[in-house]
Amino acid sequence: DVERTTCPPEKEVHEIDESLIFYKKRELEACVDAALLAAQMDRVDAIPFTYEQLDVLKHKLDELYPQGYPESVIRHLGHLFLKMSPEDIRKWNVTSLETLKALLKVSKGHEMSAQVATLIDRVVVGRGQLDKDTVDTLTAFCPGCLCSLSPERLSSVPPSVIGAVRPQDLDTCGPRQLDVLYPKARLAFQNMSGSEYFVKIRPFLGGAPTEDVKALSQQNVSMDLATFMKLRREAVLPLTVAEVQKLLGPHVEGLKVEEQHSPVRDWILKQRQDDLDTLGLGLQGGIPNGYLILDLSVREALS
């Protein structure tokens, strides 16, 4: 049989409608005009195309828009978004939050974290900054997605927007991202009273420097162990036993449970054993009494 690449007359497509779900992949390829598909994208998601058929439709759009789809097409991708790779999405320019919402909804329940992260990145680039409306959309439709942004992108968040970020939105943020967000949060919440300030700043403390952690220890905040464990190792190591005791308040007993985990383990190694003993928790591994500590890094800096 000669391979058929032309569309049989009875299968010719004049509009995108339900009848197309009965077309085989090959028939869709031969019979659907890419320009017609692009013009009637608003109809596509209402038609329950199979995953395999979506491959063909994507191929059509890729041929029509090799430099990336226009937003008029992206807005109506619907389940076709499931077929997009991060490389495809990097070619897009997206400014509309309605487009973002529509695609975030489709991605739910599918393993698409890389695609979603790239999409959010394109929205931030398209809108020029991570504004309040974008943050509100992310927190409503994609909790945790804020942390998919690079520190560079997060640096475009104005401090005024930080108040819209909820603790659960920061759960998956890494240290580099919190390093960027913490100073903005500090600025955003600076006029709040002690206890109110601590509640607000707590999710961002993974980016706090030692000075700020020391300052908190003077404010009777009773930091919970989970927050303490998320502090930067470098911020915890210079703290004295007295400062940690003041910082944690009644939660200090939790140090025993976390004795083997960083940053507690590293902090214990830096403390005098007799100072640790004052806590009465049985923490072991501190510097034995009578030992002299030479900080060679200081001597090197002076020479």
């Epitope: 049989d1 391979e3 058929r4 197309l20 779900i21 009965f22 077309y23 085989k24 992949k25 090959r26 028939e27 869709l28 329950p48 199979t50 995953y51 395999e52 058929q53 389940h79 329940g109 599918h110």
Partner: antibody, heavy 118, light 107 residues
Framework: EVQLQQSGAELVKPGASVKLSCTAS????????MHWVKQRTEQGLEWIGR????????KYAPKFQGKATITADTSSNTAYLQLSSLTSEDTAVYYC???????????WGQGTSVTVSS | DIVMTQSQKFMSTSVGDRVSITCKAS??????VGWYQQKPGQSPKALIY???NRHTGVPDRFTGSGSGTDFTLTISNVQSEDLADYFC?????????FGGGTKLVIK
């Protein structure tokens, strides 16, 4: 009336191969996908794979990759399923079915019983 | 692979009753679900395609519904000839997968 006529029962030895056929009447297989499905006694249905007879494009369930080969001959309007390196696990009834682009299976053959025994 | 779960292996009903057989997909399959009837010693027969559309010649007492992950085949006014196994199939993504089947038993 649409009909899918399958070849007769097979009794084959372990390690051998078998080729089953499915001939369509009242429609042209080129216009449809042709699927093969396995059913073991008192067990459910398992999709083996399908072919687009028009261009020979096939798709298999990972489980049957290497075990099953689906082919089609449009001149005789027939689809085939070849099973290789047979074991007792391959003892089952095999059905062919035709379907449109949706992937659903609209019409089924009567089934071919394959028994693998020494 | 997408797993199709038919939690009821057997369903007992009486002639004239209404019975609902359910099928749950492990992920969203939109409306790409078919229902098949297999009578003892026979090959499967298509009843419903695309979740809610009856195949030609299927009595209107058979109704399909659902989308996404939850699907139902309802047989109203059950007849003695409806004694059979009923399977759901997802054809949204390959490998296509069937539910384990529900055997309808007439009291």
């Amino acid at each position: 009336e649409v009909q899918l006529q399958q070849s007769g029962a097979e009794l084959v030895k372990p390690g051998a191969s078998v080729k089953l056929s499915c001939t369509a009447s009242a429609f042209n297989i080129k216009d449809y996908y042709m699927h093969w499905v396995k059913q073991r006694t008192e067990q459910g249905l398992e999709w083996i794979g399908r072919i687009d007879p028009e261009d020979g494009e096939t798709k298999y369930a990972p489980k049957f990759q290497g075990k099953a080969t689906i082919t089609a001959d449009t001149s005789s309007n027939t689809a085939y399923l070849q099973l290789s390196s047979l074991t007792s696990e391959d003892t089952a009834v095999y059905y062919c079915a035709s379907g449109s682009g949706t992937g659903a299976m609209d019409y089924w053959g009567q089934g071919t019983s394959v028994t693998v025994s020494s | 692979d997408i797993v199709m779960t038919q939690s009821q292996k057997f369903m007992s009903t009486s002639v004239g009753d209404r019975v609902s057989i359910t099928c749950k997909a492990s992920q969203n399959v939109r409306t790409a679900v078919g229902w098949y009837q297999q009578k003892p010693g026979q090959s499967p027969k298509a009843l419903i395609y695309l979740a809610s559309n009856r195949h030609t010649g299927v009595p209107d007492r058979f109704t399909g519904s659902g989308s996404g992950t939850d699907f139902t085949l309802t047989i109203s006014n059950v007849q003695s000839e409806d004694l059979a196994d009923y399977f759901c199939l997802q054809h949204w993504n390959s490998p296509y997968t069937f539910g384990g089947g529900t055997k309808l038993v007439i009291k």
